[in-house]
Interface confidence: low
């Protein structure tokens, strides 16, 4: 807390400029009018204030706006934003995407700080949903942003926003998140033709059910092994050898290298060995010829 002292004669700030960097903390407190600071916030960024001096400037704004800063001030905070606490930011009402971009720029290149996370949370809640422009902006600054949301939070993402998602934005998503995102992507891309649709939907297929994989196998998509290995095991297990062969196309050769890993390993265990042999890849571990396969899950469903 800076002690209240009278401003020395001739030191009253008429504008926010470089001369203020030579002011002591108490002089800044006494000689800079908070309303002047608020109207000239855009100048603060260009002046190399010390962290201690920034603390004083923040204190003056806090006194002027105890209920939270107006957006006109927030937009021009610049590196003073780094001095804000999540508690400060919770008082703000940020509605402009330009304001959000300006503040994200300050934190660019760093991990999402608690301040930034709170800012994004306030902004998204204010908008009511993660619209396309917001998602575009957030994933540009933080490619992992989408995968940092809980499945519950992802459920508020409208299908139209999915167009903004790039494959790298989904790199760190887990199956539960893809379960939520996949139906939205399917809806978003539903009017595209086969090959274009596959290019767009590919990154989301970790959330696809068996029936969609069966449908894709009829479309000559040539899924690569990296995508296949990210599919849900429970979605892959019911696929026949012929369906997997069609789904992977020329990439089917890669099954041999992955035969000990999920979901390939579990899928092999469910296939007849003579069906696997038709692939000519030397895949072993299928159900021996002559054995009867009982689908107990189907029997339970019927009883």
């Amino acid at each position: 807390e800076v002690e209240k002292t009278a401003c020395p004669s001739g030191k009253k700030a008429r504008e926010i400029d470089e001369s203020l960097i030579f002011y002591k903390k108490w002089e800044l407190e006494a000689c800079v009018d908070a309303a002047l600071l608020a109207t000239q916030m855009d100048r603060v960024n260009a002046i190399p204030f010390t962290y201690e001096q920034l603390d004083v400037l923040k204190h003056k704004l806090d006194e002027l706006y105890p209920q939270g800063y107006p957006e006109s001030v927030i937009q021009h905070l610049g590196y003073l934003f780094l001095k804000m606490s999540p508690e400060d930011i919770r008082k703000w009402n940020v509605t402009s995407l330009e304001t959000l971009k300006a503040l994200l720029e300050v934190n660019k290149g760093h991990e999402m700080s608690p301040q930034v996370a709170t800012l994004i949370d306030r902004f998204v809640k204010g908008r009511g949903q993660l619209d396309k422009d917001t998602l575009d902006t957030l994933t540009a600054f933080y490619p992992g942003y989408l995968c940092s949301l809980s499945p519950e939070e992802l459920s508020s993402v409208p299908p139209s926003s999915i167009w903004a998602v790039r494959p790298q934005d989904l790199d760190t998503c887990d199956p539960r998140q893809l379960d939520v995102l996949y139906p939205k992507a399917r809806l978003a891309f539903q009017n595209m033709n086969g090959s274009e649709y596959f290019v767009k939907i590919q990154s989301f297929l970790g959330g696809a059910p068996t029936e969609d994989l069966k449908a894709l196998s009829q479309q000559n998509v040539s899924m690569d092994l990296a995508t296949f290995m990210k599919l849900r095991t429970d979605a892959v297990l019911p696929l026949t050898v012929a369906e997997v062969q069609k789904l992977l196309g020329p990439h089917v050769e890669g099954l041999k290298a992955e035969e000990r890993h999920r979901p390939v390993r579990d899928w092999i265990l469910r296939q007849r060995q003579d069906d696997l042999d038709t692939l000519g890849l030397g895949l072993q571990g299928g159900i021996p010829n002559g054995y009867l396969v009982l689908d107990l899950s189907m029997q339970e469903a019927l009883s």
Partner: nanobody
Framework: EVQLVESGGGLVQPGGSLRLSCAAS????????MGWFRQAPGKGRELVAS????????YYPDSVEGRFTISRDNAKRMVYLQMNSLRAEDTAVYYC???????????WGQGTQVTVSS
């Protein structure tokens, strides 16, 4: 109620190693990111490592990159900080912290003292 309890601090010589542990209870760990912060006397809290609970995305500031490693065991609800090549400037109280995804670090442990001195 969320509880974070750190252990593993102590006195170590420069160049030595320590492994800090943080036991978490009272929440579904998968919905949280975890971090380690430190606070040296007279200084503010500094984030030294964080890890995303959905994946293994980690973050380290330049001051500890290559020396510190954060890891987690979701099943045991544990978070670890392996600190190698320790320096005198690493002396601080180290805090374990947790956050809900998309929010600031809101849950803190009591801290464990790490002193690097010969």
């Amino acid at each position: 109620e969320v509880q974070l309890v750190e252990s593993g601090g102590g006195l170590v010589q420069p160049g030595g190693s320590l492994r800090l542990s943080c036991a978490a209870s009272g929440f579904i760990s998968n919905f949280y990111a975890m971090g380690w912060f430190r606070q040296a006397p007279g200084k503010g809290r500094e984030l030294v490592a964080s890890i995303n609970s959905y994946s293994d995305i980690t973050y380290y500031p330049d001051s500890v990159e290559g020396r510190f490693t954060i890891s987690r065991d979701n099943a045991k609800r544990m978070v670890y900080l392996q600190m190698n090549s320790l320096r005198a400037e690493d002396t601080a109280v180290y805090y374990c912290a947790a956050r809900w995804q998309g929010q600031g670090f809101g849950y803190w442990g009591q801290g464990t003292q790490v002193t690097v001195s010969s």
